[in-house]
């Protein structure tokens, strides 16, 4: 039975040209995290595997940095980076948990963080 929940940074915004940290946290389960995938709707950005360490998708190597922790840092943001991001936690024995973050990249210098929220 999957009892865990994923807490994410929720809806966030950042300035064009800047960087942003995508963070998720899995709680309320004793399941072992074997791998975390960071993905857009149609593109794998990176994986962090318990044995293999971090593996960044080659096409994002210049703009994505691992961490902090199991999070992911996006750099040199463009307006095209606006959209949904997913943290996918592969766990044993529970299975897969998915969290969602919406990032808006703004042209202006006003970029405020949204509230945290939970996805069961």
């Amino acid at each position: 039975m999957m009892t865990g929940t994923i807490e994410t940074t929720g809806n966030i915004s950042a300035e064009k040209g800047g960087s942003i940290i995508l963070q998720c946290h899995l709680s309320s389960t004793t399941a072992q995290v074997t791998q975390v995938n960071w993905e857009q709707q149609d593109q794998l950005l990176a994986i962090c595997n318990a044995d293999l360490g971090w593996h960044i998708s080659p096409s994002f190597k210049d703009r994505v940095a691992p961490g902090p922790g199991l999070g992911l840092t996006l750099q040199s943001l463009t307006v095209n980076d606006t959209g949904e991001y997913f943290c996918i936690y592969h766990t044993y024995p529970d299975g897969t948990y998915t969290g969602r973050i919406f990032l808006e990249v703004l042209e202006s210098s006003v970029a405020e963080h949204g509230a945290r929220f939970q996805i069961p």
Epitope: T34, D42, I47, D51
Partner: antibody, heavy 121, light 113 residues
Amino acid sequence: QVQLVQSGAEVKKPGASVKVSCKASGYAFTNYLIEWVKQAPGQGLEWIGVINPGSGGSKYNEKFKGRATITADKSTSTAYMELSSLRSEDTAVYFCARTGVYGNFLIFDYWGQGTTVTVSS
Amino acid sequence: DIVMTQSPDSLAVSLGERATINCKSSQSLLNSGIQKNYLAWYQQKPGQPPKLLIYGASTRESGVPDRFSGSGSGTDFTLTISSLQAEDVAVYYCQNDHRYPFTFGGGTKLEIK
């Protein structure tokens, strides 16, 4: 162009070890995972393990844990798979494969030509 | 580990006819959060390494003829060759690429009737 070139065929005695190499060219070696796959005569494909040449981290199929060791040499862009305590059931073709990112998926996109290992007394 | 089961083990089809290969996984390969199925199909001809045909259950690799198509979701998947050609004689494998270990099905040998 991307190429994975494996070492030549080996004949080994039971109990011995074998080390198969896989030399990569045509791409940035540390940017892609390298997988190893076994194919026994007339049989299907069996995943042995994977290495991340960037970090040096490796992961194994439980069936091969303790007997298979996968390493990578960044200076020569070469991955290695060593199998110890060989037995007759290890007679097989061993393939290395590069793992590419295709959309959301990790895919074995380029393969070596295969290395035949024969275990016989 | 995820167990992949293919059927049939072998299949004989006349040239120009449709060939259908099934693959069943012991656990769902669908991530419902992003609606993606983590399943790939490979073709292997004698004396050659496998070659990628389909990934994401239904996306054809570039250069693969459009007579090859993949379908299915969750635990049940199908590879279809709409009109069999002589060069399609091979063994076909499905593969879980949802999580390690990236297990393969047992293979389906496709021959000409």
